[in-house]
């Protein structure tokens, strides 16, 4: 029995990402005796909750518990029963709930209250449900990707354990795109910041990081589209909107009440002489791009440099991981390869958007039409946001890495959130022990 390995003491954690369009549950695991090491936590499961995001359950708030049942039961199956009581569960809600809170704090509180009551009924160690700030969302996304890329590890290696790792300790910036907001987070070259609101200081594994972050509410891909439509319908001469961001031959009737129900379109709201209008796609990338640019106010900047809408943005520095909808959209369009230049991406988008709707439906027969119809706009929006919004150039484009997963774990804010709340990222570098005492007897 001298060399017989003892069963490893494994710990688990659960984070629910309550996004604007849907909720996902992530299960993480790690060896208990290594929980202060970098890179040991990994995702074992993602469960996508069927149905829309929790902010849409306002009229059916008591059913939120039922909505979460399948994924919570899945967690019960995946995590060994003996571990249930010590497994923390966190729910973080993002921009969909931030928008609901802007409309009605009472309704947002009611939704969260029902979520908390529902999640408390499971045998796990429920730690609470809250709306995280945009700054947290950006910061935790940055922590996640750098943790998974091994950037916090002080051990130098002659080999690369993960893609994109250039064996240096320079952190990656994080670009996150959701349905209702988008975040940019990175370590700028200049340590001093002109805008304290956008500055974060971390001490992780014995090293100080001065991080820039900003979350643009209403600039997620879904809310950006609603903004664009609200802007464009202002100048429409009748109830037909010829839209370059949709394929030629595509038609969709939109209710004006749906258009104006989000706080994101308030600035464009006006009394229209019709209750509905019809979008008719004309599929022109260049015109779509121009229309999207009108959402970014670049005429005012009280700092040395801005992104848009008067928000400070320091000069871009280093490599960036672009994840969530940045990845999902670009992956669908087959544009995630490191070898594809920005010029080539633009060219491909022009070609894609100009394809007739009937042709697109035939080519992607397995994809739901509601999603299929969005890719021309979403792809164009991503290019506009990165190039004109964040000032990436044709040259710096090659520093953007579209990332879905790193080492089997999804890129996103949830892992960083859990690492922080479980105190698994120490401020100081842990003393390395040659051999874990619990491994052999």
């Amino acid at each position: 029995t001298q060399n017989k390995a003892l069963p490893e003491n494994i710990k688990y954690g659960i984070v629910l990402d309550a996004g604007s369009s849907h909720t996902s549950l992530y299960i993480y695991k790690w060896p208990a005796e290594k929980e202060n090491d970098t890179g040991v936590v990994h995702q074992v499961e993602e469960c996508r909750v069927k149905g829309p995001g929790i902010s849409k359950y306002v009229q059916k708030v008591n059913e939120i518990g039922i909505y979460l049942t399948d994924c919570m039961e899945r967690a019960r199956e995946v995590i060994p029963r003996s571990q249930h009581q010590e497994t923390p569960v966190y729910l973080g809600a993002t921009a969909g709930m931030r928008l609901l809170r802007m409309e009605s704090e009472e309704l947002a509180d009611r939704v969260l209250d029902v979520v908390e009551r529902s999640l408390s009924n499971y045998p796990f160690d429920f730690q609470g449900a809250r709306i995280i700030t945009g700054q947290e969302e950006g910061a935790y996304g940055w922590i996640t990707i750098n943790y998974l890329l091994g950037k916090f590890s002080q051990k130098t290696r002659w080999f690369s354990i993960v893609p994109y790792e250039t064996n240096n300790q320079e952190t990656f910036g994080a670009l996150d795109l959701g349905g209702a907001s988008t975040q940019i987070t990175f370590v700028p070259q200049n340590q001093t910041t002109e805008s304290p609101d956008n500055a974060l200081q971390f001490r992780l594994y014995g090293k100080d990081y001065n991080v820039y972050t900003h979350s643009f509410l209403c600039y997620g891909k879904d809310q950006a589209l609603w903004q664009k439509l609200a802007k464009d319908i202002q100048v429409a001469s009748n109830e037909i909107l010829r839209d370059p961001c949709f394929h030629p031959g595509y038609k969709k009737v939109v209710n004006v009440s749906d258009l104006y129900k989000t706080p994101c379109t308030k600035r464009f709201e006006m009394t229209l002489p019709f209750q509905q209008f019809e979008i008719q796609g004309i599929g022109n990338y260049q015109q779509c791009h121009q229309s999207v640019l009108e959402l970014f106010n670049t005429s005012y900047c009280p700092y040395s440099q801005c992104a848009f809408n008067g928000i400070f943005l320091p000069p871009l520095q280093g490599d960036f991981g672009a994840f969530s909808a940045f990845y999902f959209v670009m992956n669908f369009l087959n544009l995630t390869s490191e070898k594809v230049s920005q010029e080539k991406v633009t060219e491909m988008m022009k070609k894609f958007c100009s394809q007739p709707w009937e042709e697109i439906k035939t080519s992607y027969a397995g994809v739901k039409e509601k999603y299929l119809s969005e890719y021309c706009f979403s792809g164009t929006y991503i290019l506009s946001l990165l190039l004109q919004g964040y000032h990436f150039t044709a040259d710096s484009w090659e520093h953007i890495h579209f990332i879905g997963k790193i080492q089997g774990s999804d890129a996103g804010w949830t892992l960083g959130y859990m690492l922080n709340l479980t105190n698994m990222i120490p401020a100081e570098q842990p003393l390395s022990t040659p051999l874990s005492h619990s491994t052999y007897v």
């Epitope: 369009s21 149905g51 829309p52 059913e63 209702a180 809310q223 589209l225």
Partner: nanobody, 124 residues
Framework: QVQLVESGGGLVQPGGSLRLSCAAS????????MGWYRQAPGKERELVAA???????NLADSTKGRFTISRDNTKNTVYLQMNSLKPEDTAVYYC??????????????????WGQGTQVTVSS
């Protein structure tokens, strides 16, 4: 759109049983859960039982041990088996389905479909 058709209601004596059926048709792939609600005269509509697309069930406290909800995926039908019925179970029973609205666009909305309702009367 999803259409829901209920059947199986009627008059039954206290202690008796009934089985309600709800047949769904249309774009049911987007349905996250189906359930039965009831509304007694002068009272608010209340959830009786629900079953998720994953087959997990939820029952109201007042019906636990007496009612069961099940489904037959091949027939797209959900059943509510009601045993040991009491006079206070008298109500109009409605079938409900909800989930992701396939007609919504750029940010998913909730779809919420209801049947016409079937009367259940428990009386001697």
């Amino acid at each position: 759109q999803v259409q829901l058709v209920e059947s199986g209601g009627g008059l039954v004596q206290p202690g008796g049983s009934l089985r309600l059926s709800c047949a769904a048709s249309g774009s049911i792939s987007s349905i996250a859960a189906m359930g039965w609600y009831r509304q007694a005269p002068g009272k608010e509509r209340e959830l009786v039982a629900a079953i998720t697309s994953g087959g997990n069930t939820n029952l109201a406290d007042s019906t636990k041990g007496r009612f069961t909800i099940s489904r037959d995926n091949t027939k797209n039908t959900v059943y509510l088996q009601m045993n040991s019925l009491k006079p206070e179970d008298t109500a109009v029973y409605y079938c409900n389905a909800w989930g992701e609205d396939d007609s919504s666009w750029f940010g998913t909305d909730l779809c919420d479909y209801w049947g016409q309702g079937t009367q259940v009367t428990v009386s001697s």
